[in-house]
Amino acid sequence: SGTTNTVAAYNLTWKSTNFKTILEWEPKPVNQVYTVQISTKSGDWKSKCFYTTDTECDLTDEIVKDVKQTYLARVFSYPAGNVESTGSAGEPLYENSPEFTPYLETNLGQPTIQSFEQVGTKVNVTVEDERTLVRRNNTFLSLRDVFGNDLGYILTYRKSSSSGKKTAKTNTNEFLIDVDKGENYCFSVQAVIPSRTVNRKSTDSPVECMGQEKGEFRE
């Protein structure tokens, strides 16, 4: 019989980007395993990641059922093999996570510039509408489908020949900006949800410059 007592999980942390949502915790298990449960404030506790030695659990399938709900998870620790448990009176050891509301808290993934098209002194820059793992009627919704007008983008652009930057904003996935004829420009975009208090902005997209493959040019 082992003598290492079971310990409760700690540092429960939600890691979520574009609704792909993983709960992480510590410690790495020694003579114990974990099972995770997730619940909405008013709902069931549903077990996931049964008897695992991992210190993370993908809860995406549960949270995408309703991304506007607030979720709580808890991690149970169970002794592995013939090891004593420290749970009092047969009660299992567990630790609660912070609350998590996907719609308000999921990180916005790095966006991608899909294309840019120049017509005279105007350039149309299109941002890819990334697919999420949120489903409706058996189809995956895009970021725009989920967030609607809450989602915007910020375009940062400059002439290839200078470092001076300008910005533009849109509530769609397209920008139409004025440019100087005969000049090449470089673009980067950032997703933003202005109404949020946390995780308002994504990281910047990779920079795309005119004169490279993404663009179409018409005089």
Epitope: D44, W45, K46, S47, K48, C49
Partner: antibody, heavy 121, light 107 residues
């Protein structure tokens, strides 16, 4: 086809130990948890514990803690359940059952044929 | 441990009858419940998983449903080959636990 084949019936004296084997075939052994469930004569089903064949990690029902040991041999896709300090109340049919994985429901979809263990002086 | 209270413990019905068995969990177990059929001298067989999903190859006369902590297993039209004992099993909490069983006989 997917199947679990268990070792034959055993008769043991009180205080002795018994080791029952369960050989899996027809699927990837490491991908599914294996459970042990027992059934005393004329009684219901009782879950004893689980082994993850991938890493050999086990979790036992508290009732059997300290008396049961589940092991596996990945080279032969076989799991074993050893129960020690046998008493007459341990007389039962012992089943291995394939059931779920880390991410799948713990439903026992494939069962062994059962091994009758009789404890008698 | 989660107690699974199954009722009735036995029942007798005629071929073609609708048969209903209930299982009540001592606390909320979400939909983490399975139903098994065990014929005399045989190993149990999975019929329903996650409260209402029919296992592949199981006849559609078997069904399951949930209302809170109450679970119902139904045979819509009892057949002679359905003579067996039926068990529910929860897996939402450790340790996994079974109901006491319901023995179904033909009148």
């Amino acid at each position: 086809q997917v199947q679990l084949v268990q070792s034959g019936a055993e008769v043991k004296k009180p205080g002795a130990s018994v080791k029952v084997s369960c050989k899996a075939s027809g699927y990837t052994f490491a991908n599914y948890y294996m459970h042990w469930v027992r059934q005393a004569p004329g009684q219901g089903l009782e879950w004893m514990g689980i082994i993850n064949p991938s890493g050999g990690i086990t979790v036992y029902a508290q009732k059997f803690q300290g008396r049961v040991t589940m092991t596996r041999d990945t080279s032969t896709s076989t799991v074993y359940m050893e129960l020690s300090s046998l008493r007459s109340e341990d007389t039962a049919v012992y089943y291995c059952a394939r059931g779920g994985s880390k991410v799948a429901a713990l439903a026992f979809d494939i069962w062994g044929q059962g091994t009758m263990v009789t404890v008698s002086s | 441990d989660i107690q699974m209270t199954q009722s009735p413990s036995s029942l007798s019905a005629s071929v073609g009858d609708r048969v209903t068995i209930t299982c009540q969990a001592s606390q909320d177990i979400s939909n983490s419940l399975n139903w098994y059929q065990q014929k005399p001298g045989k190993a149990p067989k999975l019929l329903i998983y996650d409260a209402s999903n029919l296992e592949t190859g199981v006849p559609s006369r078997f069904s399951g449903s949930r209302s809170g902590t109450d679970f119902t297993f139904t045979i819509s039209s009892l057949q002679p080959e359905d003579i067996a004992t039926y068990y529910c099993q929860q897996y939402n909490f450790h340790p996994l636990t079974f109901g006491g069983g319901t023995k179904v006989e033909i009148k």
